[in-house]
Each structure stands twice: as C-alpha cells, then as structure tokens.
Interface confidence: low
C-alpha cells in the first residue's frame, strides 16, 4: 500500500525548491525499479516529484490566501513491466499560514453621530477590521484594537472595536472629533502587523444652554400718538444651542402699568415690544418694564440647565406730540 504523512508547505517560501515530504509504496525496496508520477492541478508547475524516490518538492512560492490546499494524484509503476504497482491515489497538500496580511478596515470611512453631554460608557460605533490570514493558525488573525487619537473623550474595547464615550463632551466647545483606531494582529505580540482607520464623530445638539439677553438694559421710545398694536422696538437674546433647541419665547415679567406686551418673531428669534394701551406724555412720560426669555422646547431631563430665566430691563421714553 501507499505510505505517506500529511503534507504541509508554508506559504511565501523564498527557496527555489522546498521539500514537502515523501510518497512511496511499501513494495518499494529502494533498488530504483519503481517510477513515481504526480498528476493533477499544479503537478509539474507548482509541485514536482522525484520519480525514483517519491520525494515531493514545491518549486513555486505559494500564497495561502489565494489557495490553501491542492488535491493531487499519485501513481507508481514498475519500470520493468510498465504496470501499476499500487492503485492511483489522491492526496492533499495543505498550504500553512504565515502572518503576511495586515488587518484592514473594509467599511471606511467611518462616521457617527452622538448627542453632546452623553454619559460615559455610551456606545458610539463599532469598527471592524478583517485579516486575510488563517484564523485557526495561532494568532495570525487575532486582532486587538487600540486608540491612537481620541483620548480622553473616547475609548475602544480591545477585542470588539466598540468605541465608547469616556468623558462628557460639549458641542458648544467642539462639535466634531476625529478618532484614529489601530487594529493589530498576533494579539499585539512581536511580529504583529497593524492597520489604522479614522472615525469622524459628530456631536448632535441637546438643549443644555438657556437663552440669555444680549443687553441688560434696552432703551426704546414711543410716540404718544402711536395707536395700540404699534411695534416700538425689538430685544434680542442669544442661545448657544442650534435649531429647535435655540427657539425661544419672550414675555413680560413685570409691567405694573400693563401698557406693553412682547411677542416673539420665531423667524428671527427676536422679541417685539408692542403697545397694548395708548400712552399720554402729560400723564406719564416714561415706563420701566422687565422682560424674560425661555426656550420653547426643554425636555424634563434638561430642566437643570434652565433654572432662572434670563431677564432684561426695558426703559421706554414717551415722545410728546403737540396737541391742538
């Protein structure tokens, strides 16, 4: 019968011929009376056999990631009679892995959005690298992830590539961060190969800023001839938030005379001071009122940022009109 062990050849061998093993018949007594032949895909081009001894050699550099096994056939013939000594037999040559592929991030570029002020531990995104080496061959394809840029705001779980928040971030200070992640194979041991990827993390706005008046005092004038409903001026607050979180409502906090009102222009986010009752210079030539401003939408959990609404004082001078 046929005698052989399992055949392995390491990939990427630079030698011109690499001895893989021997294929022989147990009837072969070593007197060179038998001829061994190799058949199948790769026979003669990738692999050759010593026809006298049955020794098999690889004569080409092999790439396991391209092809991991070869199925060949062997024959042994008695030179004297030309007849087969053994039935033709199929055998396998396996290409064994070396760590010749670096981890690659295939889904680049990565981008994620996370609300500002998210608590530590909040999951941002998972990045995944793949390694073309053999996962069953030692640690060649076992990856460890680490953070090259992004501390102290982000952390990465070494074995999963899950990026989490490790420190609260304020969108109003910085609204996007670039995080650089490295994946290393061989679980970081000597000879490891690495790949990097970048993740753009954008902070979405939450309503963590209340509107604040630009001025602590506004001076307006109104003619005593002005009819009710007249707009006598505008006041303005600013809010560091954006979009819906910066929408605001103005209102009167104090107006003993109940002469004025404030309406909100939701296009410009300005407060418009309106005359509610006619004024008379001879009766009262100036007024002092207090206005306040609040955000339109404040979720319950963010109310802590909105205690004590911003207020401003408005001095209104009445202009005299000559009366007939």
């Amino acid at each position: 019968g046929w005698v052989w062990n399992q055949f392995f050849v390491p990939e990427e061998m630079n030698t011109t011929s690499h001895h893989i093993g021997q294929l022989r018949s147990d009837l072969d007594n070593g007197n060179n009376s038998f001829q061994y032949k190799l058949l199948g895909a790769g026979a003669g081009s990738t692999f050759i056999i010593d026809e006298r001894t049955g020794d098999i050699y690889a004569i080409q550099k092999l790439d396991r990631e391209e092809r991991s096994l070869y199925i060949l056939r062997a024959q042994v013939i008695d030179i004297a009679t030309g007849r087969a000594v053994e039935p033709e037999s199929e055998f396998v040559i396996k290409v064994s892995d070396i760590n010749d592929n670096e981890p690659k991030f295939l889904d680049e570029p990565y981008e994620a959005i996370v609300p500002e002020m998210s608590p530590e531990g909040t999951l941002v995104i998972q990045v995944t690298a793949s390694d073309a080496d053999d996962p069953s061959s030692g640690n060649n394809a076992r990856l460890l992830y680490s953070l090259l840029q992004g501390q102290p705001y982000f952390s990465v779980e070494p074995t999963t590539g899950v990026i989490r928040i490790s420190s609260k971030m304020d969108r109003e200070l910085q609204d996007e961060y670039w995080v650089i992640i490295q994946a290393k194979d061989m679980i970081g041991q000597p000879g490891a190969l690495s790949g990097t990827t970048s993740v753009l993390i954008k902070l979405s706005d939450v309503n963590d800023n209340k509107p604040i008046f630009k001025e602590s005092l506004y001076r307006l004038t109104v003619s005593e001839s002005a009819p009710t409903g007249t707009s006598i001026g505008t006041i303005m607050a600013y809010d560091n938030d954006i979009g819906e979180n910066a929408e605001m409502d103005y209102s009167i906090e104090e107006d003993d005379s109940q002469t004025f009102d404030i309406i909100t222009n939701h296009e410009t986010q300005e407060g418009i001071v309106i005359l509610k009752k006619k004024v008379d210079f001879e009766h009262q030539n100036h007024y002092g009122i207090r206005a306040k401003v609040k955000n339109h939408h404040v979720p319950e959990q963010l109310m802590k940022y909105h205690t004590e609404a911003s207020t401003t004082f408005i001095k209104i001078q009445v202009e005299d009109v000559d009366e007939p």
Partner: antibody, heavy 116, light 111 residues
C-alpha cells in the same frame, strides 16, 4: 484667538539634532492634536508629525527614524527634535493646530539652516 | 514627488475665473477623506482657505470655492484680484501613510 510661536536656533551643524519649541497662547494645548510641518526654500509643504495632548504621536514614515515630538502641558508648549540633520533638512519649520483633519492655526514659521 | 498632484502654475487676468486641480488616489481622497486648501502669500505662513472640501472659514471671501469628486478635488477663484497672487496647496489624509499629505503647490499669477 489661538496663536502659535516657534522658537529655536536658526543654524544647526550637519549630523547634529535640530530642536524647536512651539508655544501656544490664547487657548489650552489640551484636547487637540498639534503638528510640525516644514517647507524647504522654494519648495512645497511636508508634514513631519503630530502629538495628541494625551501624548500619542504619529510621524511621517519618511522621517520616523529621526523625529521625536513631545509635549509640556504645564508650559502650553510642544517640541520637535530631528536628529542626524543634513543640508536637505534646511527649511522653514511651522507648528500648527490640527482641527479634524486640517490645520486651522499656524505659527509664522522659523527658518532653520543646516550648515557647518 | 508629492502624494497629491497639482499643476505647478496657473494664471488669469483680473476679474477672470481660474481653477486649480488636486489629484489623489484610493488611499487618500478616493477613500473619502476630505480635501482642504491653503493660501500662502509671499513670505508668510499658509492660511486655511477651504476646509472639508467646500467650507470657507469666516473672513474668506465667497469668491473662493472648493469641490471634490472621486479621487480629485478643485479650488475655484472667481473675480480674480491682484491680492490673490499666491501659492495654493491642497491637503488630505492618507490611510496608507497614516498621516497628512500635501499637494506640491500651485503658483497663481494675476496678469
């Protein structure tokens, strides 16, 4: 307004080590990356390397074996050391702040000449 | 040899429109990394002109605009003025180098 100012010797002898410091004012060195970039006379810009305020560094592969960038947060400064210099290292050296993947603030630059 | 390729020079008369191209590869612009543009007036440090392909920092006139497509990007300047005469550099990030790369620069001459 963030301002950056390079300082260091303008003349370095061949085979010696070039040392430059960048002082950041008008803002904290914390929570950003900071880069060194150079420009040989009459030529284009070349990124040398950066340091993140946590201390992580990344260098241009062509200069990696000779470059060290370090940080002194207490002084709001970061520094460049380039060893074994030759005439080819003669350039204007700029420090800059990385914002995302571009450079939004630059120093005015300092010319370093390598000559014996 | 720069990783990003720019024409060495362009020119135009006052009031005209000029464009400067910047060609990269699959490891930088083609991967999806943004392109940024800098203006360097004679004897001064580079100044950020366009970031994130097409965004102008405050103070940069709207005569300057940027765009990106595939593995290349371009900077357009309309209504050319004498003070636009300068060197212009494109810049991106390269994943194979794990670092920032610049174009070789383009000198703009206003005729």
């Amino acid at each position: 307004q963030v301002q950056l100012q390079e300082s260091g010797p303008g003349l370095v002898k061949p085979s010696e080590t070039l040392s430059l410091t960048c002082t950041v004012s008008g803002g904290s060195i914390s929570s950003y990356s900071w880069s060194w970039i150079r420009q040989p006379p009459g030529k284009g810009l070349e990124w040398i390397g950066y340091i993140y305020y946590s201390g992580s560094t990344n260098y241009n592969p062509s200069l990696k074996s000779r470059v060290t960038i370090s940080l002194d947060t207490s002084k709001n400064q970061f520094s460049l050391k380039l060893s074994s210099v030759t005439a080819a290292d003669t350039a204007v050296y700029y420090c800059a702040r990385n914002w995302a993947f571009h450079f939004d603030y630059w120093g005015q630059g300092t010319l370093v000449t390598v000559s014996s | 040899q720069s990783v990003l390729t720019q024409p060495p020079s362009v020119s135009g008369a006052p009031g005209q429109r000029v464009t400067i191209s910047c060609t990269g590869s699959s490891s930088n612009i083609g991967t999806g990394y943004d392109v940024h543009w800098y203006q360097q007036l004679p004897g001064t440090a580079p100044k950020l002109l366009i970031h994130g392909n097409s965004n102008r920092p405050s103070g940069v006139p709207d005569r300057f605009s940027g765009s990106k497509s595939g593995t290349s990007a371009s900077l357009a300047i309309t209504g050319l003025q004498a003070e636009d005469e300068a060197d212009y550099y494109c810049q991106s990030y390269d994943s194979s180098l794990s670092g920032w790369v610049f174009g070789g620069g383009t000198r703009l001459t206003v005729l």
